[in-house]
Interface confidence: low
């Protein structure tokens, strides 16, 4: 499929001008290659009319130009003094006319309307409101006022001052007679339809002395704005329909066959299943404007989109609308990354997030998509060292492997972690990608004790058991903090006895904390990686308490699950007392509701949110 994109149809009137924008992937080759506009012949050839190399056909001399905008990946063809002879099929393209790097454009130039003298022309957008003003003389002030529409050769009554309303206009038309000082009556038609276009006649009085005024109503279907985005990227549709529909339900729909427009999302809570997890409808402003963000763009997302306002939350005749034609460029600069990542309860996932490598210094973010209230995506972690409180100790955003990819690790998975997550940066807004985390049946591969208590001044050894499937991976221990997980020295203790049917390639790797201090309290992770690519992780919380009895402390897997004060014997470990502590994540909701992104001067900031779920603290 050609990556060149432009308007499929361009309509204009004789004597007017058109401006046609064609989009291309802005690679260095494309930016500098020849751009052309040609007319398709009946036998299939395409005759150049204008090109970026300076050629202009005699047909276009003095009335057309072609301008390349290489930084945007667009070129624009302007054609003036249009005639009906310009109607036809054209191509805008790159390189050689016959090579196929082009887009078909249909240009339709129609005759201007033949209007009666003294005709007032009203040009109004579909779905909007028109006010037709009708002046009259004093002698007709008390006489019947009426508006007719010319249907073929005959005028058909639309509305009159005696109360008649044509059924086609029921509920959307009114006749206003101004105060005695003004010799004027007005007909207001709301929710304009394409079928409302045509010639109207307003009349005051019914005899030969009646006052008449001709009006021509043109109802414009909105020209779609062209939007050119990369596969796997994202698009934002900004929809501003005006304050008169501020309190009416809004929608975004995608045109399918014929006139059907399938709702993508609306403010009544409807959302198409194909967009689950990758769409946000931003709350509307007081003036009724709103925007819709779609991420993880797919080939099948290409097409014509309409946003509008109607109490049903879907397109109806007379809905005010805005239109876009979305082209999804398959020659995408956004690399492929997994759209689904699977993990098991108690296990972990490592998610790779792409970003624009030119923006390596941009701040990286990860957020959890929520479907409620038209979709939102509250932040969970960023590369500045902010982590949402409920995720402390089990979530980390790493700049590795770098060069266009960062990594997010989430462990201690539960079924509540299943859902859609967005990777984004504060740089290029188009690089927003979606990943779905699925929780599947199974056991975590890495085995570590539950929460562990260390004694001040003593030595603590914490085991991590790696099955043989990770024999070729680098194994590590690290201490979690808001900015990542700092690597710690660890010892390979030889094969692990924790796995059935696992040979000598299984491994027990221990973390040793010598002369434990209060600073050693916190979350520790063991994990596997290959170079800068991270695999599974497991987390252990180490609490530190005052010395009770001398000695060092080993922690076994069996004792990890022991009840408080229960004595447990495990081969290879000395008998110790295991003080179970409450998981610190359970305290998260009890922390002060404050965003402690502290400033240099020590001031504190707090957070308000539209959702009580956001009311956990956060740490820096």
């Amino acid at each position: 499929k050609s990556p060149i994109f432009g308007p499929e149809e361009v309509n204009s009137v004789e004597g007017n001008s058109v401006s046609i924008t064609c989009y291309y992937p802005p690679t260095s080759v494309n930016r500098h290659t020849r751009k052309y506009w040609c007319r398709q012949g009946a036998r299939g050839g395409c005759i150049t009319l204008i090109s970026s190399e300076g050629y202009v056909s005699s047909k276009y001399a003095g009335r057309a130009n072609l301008t390349n905008f290489p930084e945007n990946g667009t070129f624009v063809v302007n054609i003036a003094q249009l005639s009906q002879d310009d109607s036809g099929r054209y191509k805008c393209g790159l390189g050689i006319n016959s090579r196929g790097l082009s887009f078909d454009v249909s240009l339709e130039v129609s005759q201007g309307p033949g209007l009666l003298n003294d005709t007032k022309v009203y040009t109004v957008d579909l779905g909007r409101t028109v006010t037709i003003n009708c002046p009259f003389k004093t002698e007709n002030a008390q006489k019947r006022k009426s508006l007719y529409k010319q249907i073929g050769l005959y005028p058909v009554l639309v509305i009159d001052s005696s109360g008649y309303v044509n059924p086609n206009y029921t509920g959307r038309i009114r006749l206003d007679i101004q105060g005695t000082g003004q010799l004027l009556f007005s007909v207001v038609i709301n929710q304009l339809r394409l079928s409302d276009a045509g010639q109207y006649l307003c009349q005051a009085g019914d005899d030969s002395n009646s006052n008449k005024k001709n009006a021509d109503l043109q109802v414009l279907k909105p020209e779609p704005e062209l939007v050119y985005e990369d596969l796997r990227g994202s698009v934002t549709f900004h929809c501003a329909l005006g304050p008169e529909v501020a309190n009416v339900a809004k929608f975004l729909c995608r045109q399918s066959s014929g006139e059907n427009c399938d709702v993508v999302v609306n403010t009544l809570g409807k959302r198409a299943p194909a967009f689950e997890g990758r769409i946000l409808l931003n709350p509307q402003d007081k003036d009724g404007s709103f925007s819709v963000v779609i991420t993880g763009l797919r080939k099948e997302d290409a097409g014509r989109y309409l946003c509008g306002a109607h109490s049903d939350g879907q397109l109806q005749e007379g809905s005010p609308i805005q239109a876009w034609q979305l082209f999804v460029n398959e020659e995408s600069t956004i690399p492929r990354s997994p759209t689904v990542v699977k993990g098991v309860a108690g296990g972990s996932v490592a998610v790779l997030c792409p970003y624009n490598r030119k923006e390596s210094k941009s701040i990286k973010y990860w957020c959890l998509w929520e479907g409620a209230q038209n979709g939102r995506c509250p932040l969970l972690v960023d590369s500045e060292g902010w982590v949402k409180a409920q995720y402390e100790g089990r979530l980390s955003l790493l700049e590795e492997p770098g060069n266009g990819t960062f990594t997010v690790i989430l462990n201690q998975l539960t079924s509540r972690d299943a859902g859609f997550y967005w990777c984004l940066t504060n740089g290029d807004t188009l690089w927003r990608t979606t990943v779905e985390i699925k929780i599947i049946e199974g056991e975590p591969n890495l085995k570590v004790p539950g929460n562990v208590t260390a004694v001040l001044g003593e030595t603590l050894k914490v085991p991590c058991h790696f099955p043989c499937k990770f024999s070729s991976y680098e194994k590590y221990w690290c201490k979690w903090n808001n900015t990542g997980c700092q690597a710690l020295p660890s010892q390979d203790e030889g094969p692990s006895k924790a796995f059935v049917n696992c040979d000598e390639n299984s491994r027990l790797v221990s973390l040793t904390l010598n002369l434990v201090t209060r600073a050693d309290e916190g979350w520790y992770w063991c994990g596997v990686k290959q170079g800068h690519f991270y695999g599974e992780t497991a987390a252990v919380y180490v609490a530190v308490e005052e010395r009770k009895a001398a000695g060092s402390r080993d922690v076994s897997l069996a004792k990890a699950d022991a009840a408080p004060d229960e004595k447990v014997l495990d081969s290879g470990f000395r008998e110790i007392e295991n003080k179970a502590i409450q998981d610190p994540r359970l305290f998260a909701e009890e922390k002060a509701v404050a965003d402690t992104r502290d400033q240099a001067d020590g001031s504190r900031a707090s957070v308000d949110s539209g959702s009580s779920e956001e009311q956990g603290g956060s740490s820096r």
Epitope: T236, N282, I363, N426, S609
Partner: nanobody, 123 residues
């Protein structure tokens, strides 16, 4: 490229109100978080308030909470700071900032800054 222009500053008495506006050019406005920072003479620039791109989250400096309200109008590409019950210690140059996805109090997520508007509160 986003450009930010603040307005609405001035000289007021303690206890009075002011409404600051920040007009942004650039159509990506509605996908960015916006924030207000302030800088008093001889002090570091300090965070005042921020609002997320979709207006679902607002952040405030503790000392202004309940007195200041941040809001935005994406259709008009404008962010506002309504300042009530002003105190002499609110005197500073107020800066509008933009360019982060998520509102926050650190200066680093904000790529774009206005020139500032002076607010002086006399006792």
């Amino acid at each position: 490229e986003v450009q930010l222009v603040e307005s609405g500053g001035g000289l007021v008495q303690a206890g009075d109100s002011l409404r600051l506006s920040c007009a942004a050019s650039g159509r990506t406005f509605s996908t960015y978080a916006m924030a207000w920072f302030r800088q008093a003479p001889g002090k570091d620039r300090e965070f005042v308030a921020a609002i997320s791109w979709s207006s679902d989250m607002t952040y405030y400096l503790d000392s202004v909470k309940g007195r200041f309200t941040i809001s935005r109008d994406n259709a008009k590409n404008t962010v506002f700071l309504q300042m009530n019950s002003l105190k002499p210690e609110d005197t500073a140059v107020y800066y509008c900032a933009s360019g982060a996805y998520y509102a926050g109090s650190s200066t680093s997520p904000y790529n774009y800054w206005g020139q500032g508007t002076q607010v002086t509160v006399s006792s």
